[in-house]
């Protein structure tokens, strides 16, 4: 079988949620050595990087000026050691926002709730869309997707107090062009039916997988490299729509 | 057809009590909101009770002294309210699956015509 150096890790420095006209930037992370990185959207070739030098740093960073729908698909990237090419990367989805209009965003029975409500979200855009949105900050990755004519709901279900946080929503012209995000909806969820005063959120933290972590090499990160960059491989998990 | 009437409202001296009364009817709903607005106010938030189940849910600033109850029977929901203060005078609303917007107030299809509580010290 045809060999081939282990995958790169595809990330987007910041967000993968890019809003019109901003520059998107994406990182592709290899290997020290690398003489070039390739970045494909929706299978076909967009750009390529050759770092320099190869051997001082394990990854480049592919900036996408001028985000539009155009340029909001399936990006994948690969490297080359030599003549030896990597397989290809998991597959990151950049989206442009900011399309449009501005939904929105309600919850029922209200923003203050106890521990075992149901809770339910509602998006709401009056402008033709069907496809519907709903993340929470911090947690960018899990999306929720509902379906409606100009309002989706979200059903929540009992609430726990690991629901607490801030929440968005955004309409979908397709799964790559989103609307403007809706101001958020901020949920407190108190302990328990019978105590109801209010508890602070749990603080959120900007997700680790949207941060680009390219290193200069030192003497000892050489050694390190190829373990360091299987287990990411290993242990990254991607999202998909 | 549904419509929601609120009844009850009337003048008392500060420390007397009252009883709301918000009469639900055309269809079967979730929740029943019960909200105010003091002249030159914002609308505000006082309690709410899901009609399954008859969990509660107050405001802080009237804890502990206004009680929200359903008689499912009849398709009511009471507020009672005791050791009234001057600062609880207000026209209260009763609104069915009132739900809190982005835009910062609680939108909901169905609302009440309010009925007037007026607190003398």
């Known amino acids: 079988p045809k060999q081939t150096l282990p995958k790169p890790i595809i990330r987007a420095e910041s967000t993968y949620m890019v809003p019109k006209e901003k520059q998107a930037t994406l990182c592709c992370q290899g290997s020290y050595g690398a003489v070039e990185y390739q970045l494909h959207f929706e299978g076909s070739l967009f750009a390529v990087e050759r770092p320099k030098p190869p051997e001082r740093i394990n990854g480049v960073k592919f900036h996408i000026p001028d985000m539009n729908s155009r340029k909001a698909g399936r990006y994948s990237c690969i490297y080359r050691v030599g003549e030896l090419w990597s397989e290809r990367s998991d597959l990151l989805d950049l989206v442009v926002t900011e399309m449009y209009d501005t939904p929105t965003l309600s919850v029922h029975p209200g923003p203050e709730v106890t521990s075992g409500e149901k809770v339910t979200f509602y998006c709401r855009l009056d402008t033709a869309t069907s496809m519907f949105l709903l993340l929470k900050e911090g947690r960018s990755r899990d999306v929720q997707r509902s379906y409606g004519k100009v309002q989706a709901e979200f059903p929540m279900g009992p609430v726990t107090t690991a629901h607490r946080g801030s929440y968005r929503c955004f309409g979908s012209y397709n799964n790559y062009a989103w609307s403007f995000p809706s101001e958020p909806v901020k949920l407190l969820v108190t302990g328990d039916i019978e105590n109801t005063s209010l508890a602070p959120t749990d603080p959120t933290f900007p997700d680790s997988w949207d941060t680009c972590l390219l290193t200069r090499e030192t003497g000892l990160q050489k050694d390190l490299a190829l373990w360091d960059h299987t287990a990411q491989n290993h242990h990254h998990h991607h999202h998909h729509h | 057809q549904v419509q929601l009437v609120e009844s009850g409202g009337g003048m008392v001296q500060a420390g007397g009590s009252l009883r709301l009364s918000c009469a639900a009817s055309g269809r079967t709903f979730n929740t029943i909101h019960w909200f105010r607005q003091a002249p030159g106010k914002e609308r505000e938030f006082v309690a709410r009770?899901?009609?399954?189940?008859?969990?509660?849910f107050y405001a802080d600033s009237v804890k502990g002294r206004f009680t929200i109850s359903r008689d499912n029977t009849e398709n009511l929901v009471y507020l009672q309210m005791n050791s009234l203060k001057p600062e609880d005078t207000a026209v209260y609303y009763c609104?069915?699956?009132?739900?809190?917007?982005?835009?910062?107030?609680?939108?909901?299809?169905?609302w009440g015509p309010g009925t007037q509580v007026t607190v003398s010290s």
């Open positions: 609104a069915a699956d009132a739900r809190y917007t982005s835009h910062g107030y609680y939108e909901s299809d169905y």
């Open positions: 009770i899901w009609w399954i189940g008859g969990a509660t």
